[in-house]
């Protein structure tokens, strides 16, 4: 039994049942048609959550693009809707159905007006290029320290086997365009640049094409040549706060660091009536520090809930890396609840939280 590709020209709002896994359907729609793709669960069993992908990018539902677990509808199709569509299991990214969709300029009449561009049903899986591992192509920005090596990859497939070419900032990119040249591995769909320098910065696009279509992916390369420095803290953060007894308070600290920063929140305390030790170092207690499951984002915020008068005082955001430490401090003033009402009536400058 042939696992060949079924050739169809589909009229308006026709629903296309999904191919068996391993097949790729070649579908032609007319401009203005409603493209409907159907991908029933393999073997009729439960399918689980799915995602629809076009040319390697997840489709975002809209008024025109209707996404369901087993069906995709693209209303009022245009030439831009041509491409490689697939339905994938969300968790495993396993491809359940492949469709190669071409939207012709003329509305479809049920006849293949442009048949010479179409593959014959030879029993061979033919079709436009598609990304074979789109879930591994999410890293669009590469920030690379100078002198290191960069590899851009665009793993793809199609039949006939597509060609791959590369552009830099929209122009053809060849080895003679950079000192040190480039290394291409067509079988790995990759471009390698060794020992990058600042002039290598830019947008790099892979173009993968065969006679049935073309897909492209753009990556941005930034080459870092900064000398390492201690963390930089955003000016004005954390900011002084005035809060009402029993309210919630948040202090924010924005940290910039090339090197992995270690962030701590400290509260200044008194020991035996003194704020500093014999050597002049302030007495502090650590309120928040990096833990196994703590993200940098979480560490950039210190939350105090249901504040008491004891919470009033000086708070410090301390950020360190292998180069050194930086710190910014802010004060918390806690007002009694009655005062809040008076102040709010008079000036409106005190807030509860």
């Amino acid at each position: 039994e042939s696992l060949g590709t079924e050739q169809r020209v589909v009229g308006r709002a026709a629903e296309v049942p999904g191919p068996e896994p391993g097949q790729q359907e070649q579908l032609v729609f007319g401009s203005g048609d409603a493209v409907e793709l159907s991908c029933p669960p393999p073997g009729g069993g439960p399918m689980g959550p799915t995602v629809w992908v076009k040319d390697g990018t997840g489709l975002v539902p809209s008024e025109r693009v209707l996404v369901g677990p087993q069906r995709l509808q693209v209303l009022n199709a245009s030439h831009e809707d041509s491409g490689a569509y697939s339905c994938r299991q969300r968790l495993t990214q396993r491809v359940l159905c492949h469709f190669s969709v071409r939207v012709t300029d003329a509305p479809s009449s049920g006849d293949d007006e442009d048949g010479e561009d179409e593959a014959e049903d030879t029993g061979v899986d033919t079709g436009a290029p598609y990304w074979t591992r789109p879930e591994r192509m999410d890293k669009k920005l590469l920030a690379v320290p100078a002198a290191n090596t960069v590899r851009f990859r665009c793993p793809a497939a199609g039949n006939p086997t597509p060609s791959i070419s590369w552009l830099k900032n929209g122009r053809e990119f060849r080895g003679e365009h950079r000192i040190g040249g480039i290394k291409l591995r067509h079988q790995q769909w990759s471009l390698v640049m060794e020992s990058v320098v600042p002039s290598d910065r830019g947008n790099y696009t892979c173009v993968v094409e065969n006679k049935f279509g073309s897909i492209r992916q753009t990556y941005t390369l930034d080459v870092l040549e900064r000398s390492p420095h201690r963390p930089i803290l955003q000016a004005g953060l954390p900011a002084n706060q005035t809060a009402v007894l029993g309210s919630d308070v948040e202090f924010h600290c924005k940290v910039y660091s090339d090197a992995q920063p270690h962030i701590q929140w400290l509260k200044h305390v008194e020991v035996n009536g003194s704020k500093v030790g014999p050597d002049g170092t302030p007495y502090v207690t650590v309120l928040k520090t990096a833990g196994a499951n703590t993200t940098d984002k979480e560490l950039e915020v210190l939350s105090l809930h249901n504040v008491t008068f004891e919470d009033a005082g000086e708070y410090t955001c301390l950020a360190g890396n292998s180069i050194g430490f930086s710190h910014h401090s802010a004060w918390l003033v806690v007002l009694p609840a009655e005062e809040e009402l008076v102040e709010a009536d008079e000036a409106g400058s005190v807030y509860a939280g």
Epitope: N148, R153, Q188, E225
Partner: antibody, heavy 127, light 107 residues
Framework: EVQLVESGGGLVQPGGSLRLSCAAS????????ISWVRQAPGKGLEWVGR????????NYADSVKGRFTISADTSKNTAYLQMNSLRAEDTAVYYC????????????????????WGQGTLVTVSS | DIQMTQSPSSLSASVGDRVTITCRAS??????LAWYKQKPGKAPKLLIY???FLYSGVPSRFSGSGSGTDFTLTISSLQPEDFATYYC?????????FGQGTKVEIK
């Protein structure tokens, strides 16, 4: 020309400490990394650990974690391997190697390649 | 840890021979594999990185291939200076691990 020169090896008793140095020249020191690899007499290569010279991050093999510390002085273009609580099985020639990253768009990992190596320094742990 | 197994452990060959050394990873390492050459009493030298990329200055008789778990280093025409021990090494997993080495000796 890239050069790496190790020093600091020698004979040390079990439980003792030693600090190896790796002086580097000929490349932008803080852009890449330094790895330490050892080779016991007549044996194969064993990766010990790595530091990224730009951010000071380090990784270690389980066999040395908690005992060995890799650091660097960027002002001197020198990396160090501080070895504490030494054991007989730590006896080996220790190499430092410049280590650059292959930053890959694929799957968000960085491959590390050791392209220039020092001549090695012998550490013998024996009583 | 990812185990790297080289075969053969040693081989005898003559100048001009085509030599193939294989390296198998205990789990998928994609193309994150390097090959090194080491002569007795000397530091290792990088030959191949990313499974198939020839490092600059390395003669073109050396080539690498493979991805996933199975990799090959080929010397198309063995030269006198190629008699040495060859190591594969992966760096996609932590820790980086080496194969046990393949010694290429003169027949």
């Amino acid at each position: 020309e890239v050069q790496l020169v190790e020093s600091g090896g020698g004979l040390v008793q079990p439980g003792g400490s030693l600090r190896l140095s790796c002086a580097a020249s000929g490349f932008p020191f803080t852009s890449t990394g330094i790895s330490w690899v050892r080779q016991a007499p007549g044996k194969g290569l064993e990766w010990v650990g790595r530091t990224h010279l730009g951010d000071g991050s380090t990784n270690y093999a389980d066999s040395v974690k908690g005992r060995f510390t890799i650091s660097a002085d960027t002002s001197k273009n020198t990396a160090y391997l501080q070895m504490n609580s030494l054991r007989a099985e730590d006896t080996a020639v220790y190499y430092c190697a410049r280590t650059y990253g292959i930053y890959d768009t694929y799957d968000m990992y960085t491959e590390y390649v050791m392209d220039y190596w020092g001549q090695g320094t012998l550490v013998t742990v024996s009583s | 840890d990812i185990q790297m197994t080289q075969s053969p452990s040693s081989l005898s060959a003559s100048v001009g021979d085509r030599v193939t050394i294989t390296c198998r990873a205990s789990q998928d390492v994609d193309t994150s594999l390097a090959w090194y050459k080491q002569k007795p009493g000397k530091a290792p030298k990088l030959l191949i990185y990313s499974a198939s990329f020839l490092y600059s200055g390395v003669p073109s008789r050396f080539s690498g291939s493979g991805s996933g778990t199975d990799f090959t280093l080929t010397i198309s025409s063995l030269q006198p200076e190629d008699f040495a021990t060859y190591y594969c090494q992966q760096s996609t997993g932590h820790p980086q691990t080496f194969g046990q080495g393949t010694k290429v000796e003169i027949k």
